[in-house]
């Protein structure tokens, strides 16, 4: 089995306050199977962005097409960003389970917020 | 609520070709994945073909390849069936299906009979 | 090939299990389909292994571990008689499968 790596090419990504941002996260691997989700920020208060298995996530929008059957692309649109999005965005791959449980996660996206031009 | 609703079985000569239609409401169908089931006379569920949110992949099973072909218009929350030479062996009843984001079905249509004979 | 056994029977108010072998942990999520009479639309009872539909009764439940899943009722009611596919979908072949049906009796 190929291991699966979990790719956020983006370090960093900078947007102004009521644009969109788009934060990247490719998959290697559709194995083993189960969600993805993103999350603003890590440990006990972390905020779930998007999760796979469940929704609607109204300001959140998938990049590609995730109904896809062989997708390994879960980037993500945000709209309408303000400065409480500011933070640091992981993709995480959830293994299937009950509950499902996180077995990899991205090395994660920071978001920062600019001023919206006048 | 979601309503799934097939058309266009029948009685159609072994050769010949036939055309299913299912009409989605209830739902955001532009924003799901669709499938094929068929049910022979006596027998058990067989998944024939499905076809990804935006239309552009589609999957089928070996047997059906090549003769059947999966498509769908978002414009009309419709989804279709083109079957081409047909044998008796197609005779059964056919239903769409709607898929869960892991590619499993959560709704049914009634279903349609097409019966092959001479 | 999904295997199920072919019939069950039970009396109302026992639990039932009814399992389903042959997919693989890793690459294969399970659902369950109820069909009351032959050619009538199927309902999903189970979906993902585990998850009930909103509109279905809760003592319907399903797991899955290793390379099988099962589905319980709980206080099965004659109501539930009715045949019960398993289903899955591999990741590997992007392919769904069923396994023959399980009839459930209820005495």
């Known amino acids: 089995e190929e291991e699966l790596q979990i790719i956020q090419p983006d370090k960093s990504v900078s947007v102004a306050a009521g644009e969109s941002a788009i934060l990247h996260c490719t998959i290697t691997s559709l194995f083993p199977v189960g969600p993805i989700q993103w999350f603003r920020g890590a440990g006990p208060a972390r905020v779930l962005i998007y999760n796979q298995r469940q929704g609607p996530f109204p300001r959140v929008t998938t990049v590609s097409e995730t109904t896809k059957r062989e997708n390994m692309d879960f980037s993500i649109s945000i709209s309408n960003i303000t400065p409480a999005d500011a933070g640091t965005y992981y993709c995480i791959k959830f293994r299937k389970g009950s509950p499902d449980t996180e077995f990899k996660s991205g090395a994660g996206t920071e978001l920062s917020v600019r001023a919206k031009p006048s | 609520d979601v309503q799934l609703v097939e058309s266009g079985g029948g009685v159609v000569r072994p050769g010949e070709s036939l055309r299913l239609s299912c009409a989605a409401s209830g739902f955001t169908f532009s924003s799901h994945a669709m499938s094929w089931v068929r049910q022979a006379p006596g027998k058990g569920l067989e998944w024939l073909a499905g076809i990804s949110a935006g239309g552009s992949d589609t999957y089928y099973i070996d047997s059906v390849k090549g003769r059947f072909t999966i498509s769908r218009d978002n414009s009309k929350s419709s989804l279709y069936l083109r079957m081409n030479s047909l044998t008796a062996e197609d005779t059964a009843v056919y239903y769409c299906?709607?898929?869960?984001?892991?590619?499993?079905?959560?709704?049914w249509g009634l279903g349609t009979l097409v019966t092959v004979s001479s | 090939a999904l295997t199920q056994p072919a019939s069950v029977s039970a009396n109302p108010g026992e639990t039932v299990k009814i399992t389903c072998s042959g997919g693989d942990y890793y690459s294969t999520y399970y659902a369950w389909y109820q069909q009351k009479s032959p050619g009538s639309a199927p309902v999903t009872v189970i979906h993902s292994d585990d998850e009930r539909p909103s509109d279905i009764p809760s003592r319907f439940s399903g797991s899955a571990s290793g390379s099988a899943a099962t589905l319980i009722i709980t206080g099965v009611r004659v109501e539930d008689e009715a045949v019960y596919f398993c289903?899955?979908?591999?990741?590997?072949?992007?392919?769904?499968?069923f396994g023959a049906g399980t009839t459930l009796t209820v005495l």
């Open positions: 299906a709607r898929e869960t984001w892991n590619h499993l079905f959560d709704y």
């Open positions: 289903g899955g979908y591999d990741g590997r072949t992007y392919i769904n499968t």
